[in-house]
């Protein structure tokens, strides 16, 4: 079957500091040396690109300096971390993988990870 399967967890709960991590794993039909990973956020039928990185197999993912994402790769597995999340960022985060080089190109899109973000309660003033 000429398609690439992408697997990611169904649900992840962000930490109290607004950090969420999940693994994006792809079954590569070919031996890619250059891979692009994009995280898309789907909420209310709107889709926005959260972050994207292109990496050479065996090397680290490099996101833009101002990106809210960081990540590491190991074989056909990418460990993604999204930072700075707030309750309003709750939504479906979809992992998109593209095998850029060498040919042929392959596209794979995961089913998405529902990330729940709960803003921490403000600490009450304490008199000591």
């Amino acid at each position: 079957c000429k398609a690439m399967h992408v697997a990611q967890p169904a649900v992840v709960l962000a930490s109290s500091r607004g950090i969420a991590s999940f693994v994006c794993e792809y079954a590569s039909p070919g031996k890619a040396t250059e891979v692009r990973v994009t995280v898309l956020r789907q909420a209310d039928s709107q889709v926005t690109e959260v972050c994207a990185a292109t990496y050479m197999m065996g090397n680290e993912l490099t996101f833009l300096d101002d990106s809210i994402c960081t990540g590491t790769s190991s074989g056909n597995q990418v460990n993604l971390t999204i930072q700075g999340l707030r309750a309003m960022d709750t939504g479906l985060y979809i992992c998109k993988v593209e095998l850029m080089y060498p040919p042929p190109y392959y596209l794979g899109i995961g089913n998405g990870t529902q990330i729940y973000v709960i803003d921490p309660e403000p600490c009450p003033d304490s008199d000591f």
Epitope: K2, A3, P29, V47, Y106, L107, I109
Partner: antibody, heavy 115, light 108 residues
Framework: QVQLVESGGGVVQPGRSLRLSCAAS????????IHWVRQAPGKGLEWVAV????????YYADSVKGRFTISRDNSKNTLYLQMNSLRAEDTAVYYC???????????WGQGTLVT | EIVLTQSPGTLSLSPGERATLSCRAS???????LAWYQQKPGQAPRLLIY???SRATGIPDRFSGSGSGTDCTLAISRLEPEDFAVYYC?????????FGQGTKVEIK
């Protein structure tokens, strides 16, 4: 809103060259792959070429490989198709099309005719 | 290369009728990466369906897609006058990107 506008088409003799342009607006150009698709008179759609993101990765249909070159200038939000050694069978309307977030071609230009 | 074969070549129907268009792939392709486009004379194609069954933005719900493996279907539940056009299927999961030869839906 997303807009793609092709230009540069015209009448050219076999063996000669032509350069098509596609001006993009309304979206972050460098975040998308852009394709060229052509349609011969009265015929179906034929994929021609694609260039991805920063312009390093390009793919071509076998029918144009070695004769056509796709390029992009992200600072100008413009896509190009340099067509050399043109043949009669290259006569077609040429469309540029954006590869959307999910992969399909979600926005198309109006096309430019090459004869 | 994945070859897509559409049938029928031409479909002659009346407004209000249901249209069913077929697209068959030469090898198994994931329906997650199959799209349908509509093209009217003198116009650029317009994306209707992607991922075999998801409607593109602004596409009315009378258009629906389904399928898996090598067979995909586009259905138009009740043909409106503006639906008479040529429809193309496309696979976009791997290079080279390929289109079917098209199905013309004409007024009977």
């Amino acid at each position: 809103q997303v807009q793609l506008v092709e230009s540069g088409g015209g009448v050219v003799q076999p063996g000669r060259s032509l350069r098509l342009s596609c001006a993009a607006s309304g979206f972050t150009f460098s975040s998308y792959g852009i394709h060229w698709v052509r349609q011969a008179p009265g015929k179906g759609l034929e994929w021609v070429a694609v260039i991805w993101y920063d312009g390093r990765n390009k793919y071509y249909a076998d029918s144009v490989k070695g004769r056509f070159t796709i390029s992009r200038d992200n600072s100008k939000n413009t896509l190009y198709l340099q067509m050399n050694s043109l043949r009669a069978e290259d006569t077609a309307v040429y469309y540029c099309a954006r590869a959307g977030n999910w992969g399909p071609f979600d926005s198309w230009g109006q096309g430019t005719l090459v004869t | 290369e994945i070859v897509l074969t559409q049938s029928p070549g031409t479909l002659s129907l009346s407004p209000g009728e249901r249209a069913t268009l077929s697209c068959r792939a030469s090898q198994s392709v994931s329906s997650s990466y199959l799209a349908w486009y509509q093209q009217k004379p003198g116009q650029a194609p317009r994306l209707l369906i992607y991922g075999a069954s998801s409607r593109a933005t602004g596409i009315p719900d009378r258009f629906s897609g389904s399928g898996s493996g090598t067979d995909c279907t586009l259905a138009i539940s009740r043909l409106e006058p503006e639906d008479f056009a040529v429809y193309y299927c496309q696979q976009y999961g791997s290079s080279p990107w390929t289109f079917g030869q098209g199905t013309k839906v004409e007024i009977k």
